[in-house]
């Protein structure tokens, strides 16, 4: 039975050329984490498997590094990041937990982190 | 080419063993987590056993949990399934799979090798 | 466990024609759902993941769709090389578990 909880850094915003850390945390559960996936819609951004480390797709090699922790940085914001994000833990005998984030980068210098939530 | 072929199977009396073998070509083996699945005469598919890329996690279904060991030789880049106390209905064809990067689904499947238990 | 039915068992279609296959999860699997091909004495082909995502190779004219319980897998034109039968899998949680399979068949 799934019986953990994922907790994210929830609505967050950031500026336009600058970096943002994308986390998300595991609880309630002694599930074995066998891989952690990072994803924009259905893309595929980040991988951190237990056995190989990370992974950074291709594509988002420039602009995304791993962690801190399971976390992901995006880093040289542009107006197009904006969007969902997910983090979906791979687990066992669990199965798959998800956790979503939005992202908005904001042409101002005005940009507040959103606070905490829960998602089942 | 992506390749996987299983081979070991056979005729065995109940209470016996079997070591079924997956060997992978065309990729590279050490990145990839591998499963048995098998499919009994007349029955659906069913997912048998995982093991993670580098061989530190081990996942089996209950109904062979304690008899059934998955194991892998990332050297020789070949899968093991070693199958012990078999059952009659243990009988089935046995598939090696890998499992896709991202851990969504099994995206290369071998043809199988068939494992019939009886006496 | 999770329980997968597939429906329907079986389908007589023609080629050129539109078909649906169905499953329906005993439980929310989120979109967590492949759709895989088989042909006799083949090894099963992974056409589509995640619900929806569609797996490198595969023709544009197989889809899916669906999440939570109830799934469908869409041939938008049938092809000669697409009579085969056609298994859904659960990927949301262990054991991983499949539907009874659907024979699709030349009418």
């Known amino acids: 039975m799934m019986t953990g909880t994922i907790e994210t850094t929830g609505n967050i915003s950031a500026e336009k050329g600058g970096s943002i850390i994308l986390q998300c945390h595991l609880s309630s559960t002694t599930a074995q984490v066998t891989q952690v996936n990072w994803e924009q819609q259905d893309q595929l951004l980040a991988i951190c498997n237990a056995d190989l480390g990370w992974h950074i797709s291709p594509s988002f090699k420039d602009r995304v590094a791993p962690g801190p922790g399971l976390g992901l940085t995006l880093q040289s914001l542009t107006v197009n990041d904006t969007g969902e994000y997910f983090c979906i833990y791979h687990t066992y005998p669990d199965g798959t937990y998800t956790g979503r984030i939005f992202l908005e980068v904001l042409e101002s210098s005005v940009a507040e982190h959103g606070a905490r939530f829960q998602i089942p | 080419e992506v390749q996987v072929v299983e081979s070991g199977g056979g005729l065995v009396k109940p209470g016996g063993s079997l070591r079924l073998s997956c060997a992978a070509s065309?990729?590279?083996?050490?990145?990839?987590?591998m499963s048995w699945v098998r499919q009994a005469p007349e029955q659906r598919l069913e997912w048998v056993a995982e093991?993670?890329?580098?061989?530190?996690?081990?996942f089996y279904s209950d109904t062979v949990t304690g008899r059934f060991t998955i194991s892998r030789d990332n050297a020789k880049n070949t899968l093991y399934l070693q199958m012990n106390s078999l059952r009659a209905e243990d009988t089935a064809v046995y598939y090696c799979?890998?499992?896709?990067?991202?851990?969504?689904?099994?995206?290369?499947w071998g043809q199988g090798t068939t494992v019939t238990v009886s006496s | 466990d999770v329980q997968i039915t597939q429906s329907p068992s079986s389908v007589s279609a023609s080629v050129g024609d539109r078909v649906t296959i169905n499953c329906r999860a005993s439980?929310?699997?989120?979109?967590?759902l492949a759709w895989y091909q088989q042909k006799p004495g083949k090894a099963p082909k992974l056409l589509i993941y995640?619900?929806?995502r569609l797996q490198s190779g595969v023709p544009s004219r197989f889809s899916g769709s669906g999440s939570g319980t109830d799934f469908t897998l869409t041939i938008s034109s049938l092809q000669p090389e697409d009579f085969a039968t056609y298994y859904c899998?659960?990927?949301?949680?262990?054991?991983?578990?499949f539907g009874g399979g659907t024979k699709l068949e030349i009418k």
């Open positions: 799979a890998r499992k896709t990067l991202d851990y969504y689904a099994l995206d290369y």
């Open positions: 065309g990729f590279t083996f050490s990145t990839y987590a």
């Open positions: 093991i993670s890329s580098g061989g530190s996690h081990t």
């Open positions: 439980k929310s699997i989120s979109k967590y």
């Open positions: 995640s619900g929806s």
């Open positions: 899998q659960q990927h949301n949680e262990y054991p991983w578990t």
